[in-house]
């Protein structure tokens, strides 16, 4: 995507503290990499309402990370 440059995180700022569970279509975890030195939690919203970054330090994000890691490992 032309807006992206290497070495940049996907999210601007720390992210929202919470997203209504009913609005969540999907959650993706981006782990630290060469492009971004922090974990990022990206929420895809229902009804084509785009995506939002969830603050990885928030309670909701920690629960999502735990869930995803349990599923994957």
């Amino acid at each position: 995507f032309p807006m992206f440059k290497r070495g940049r995180c996907l999210c601007i700022g720390p992210g929202v503290k919470a997203v209504k569970v009913a609005d969540i279509e999907k959650a993706s975890i981006m782990y630290p990499s060469n492009n971004c030195d922090k974990i990022e939690v990206i929420i895809t919203l229902k009804e084509n309402k785009g995506q939002r970054c969830l603050n990885p330090k928030s309670k909701q994000a920690r629960l999502i990370i735990k869930k995803v890691e349990r599923k994957n490992f």
């Epitope: 601007i12 700022g13 929202v16």
Partner: nanobody, 126 residues
């Protein structure tokens, strides 16, 4: 309480310049993406430019690249949109908006933004 107040709009001749200001209160710029949008009569609201004060990155719609410049003054909690070489098709109401948790991919999408100013009219005459 989050508040955004735009100023600096007006009537200008084609080829002229204007500087819009967006004064933010109730939050710090570093935590948010600040975007400028515009809406011409009978048209949809479109993203013009965005800035991430946390890392200084800026984004522009193709239609304004090279003519408009977005900047921020964190001490004043204000974002500016310098508009040069204005064209009649730039005529619109200009809004500033603040969004938290915005992905770079969606910086020019109005659905990414939670808070909006009341708008300032920009009219470019030929």
């Amino acid at each position: 309480e989050v508040q955004l107040v735009e100023s600096g709009g007006g009537l200008v001749q084609a080829g002229g310049s204007l500087r819009l200001s967006c004064a933010a209160s109730g939050f710090t710029l570093d935590d948010y993406a600040i975007g400028w949008f515009r809406q011409a009569p009978g048209k949809e609201r479109e993203g013009v430019s965005c800035i991430s004060s946390s890392d200084g990155s800026t984004y522009y719609a193709d239609s304004v690249k090279g003519r408009f410049t977005i900047s921020s003054d964190n001490a004043k909690n204000t974002v500016y949109l310098q508009m040069n070489s204005l064209k009649p098709e730039d005529t619109a109401v200009y809004y500033c908006a603040a969004g938290q948790g915005v992905l770079r991919l969606w910086v020019l999408s109005s659905s990414s933004y939670d808070y909006w100013g009341q708008g300032t009219q920009v009219t470019v005459s030929s």
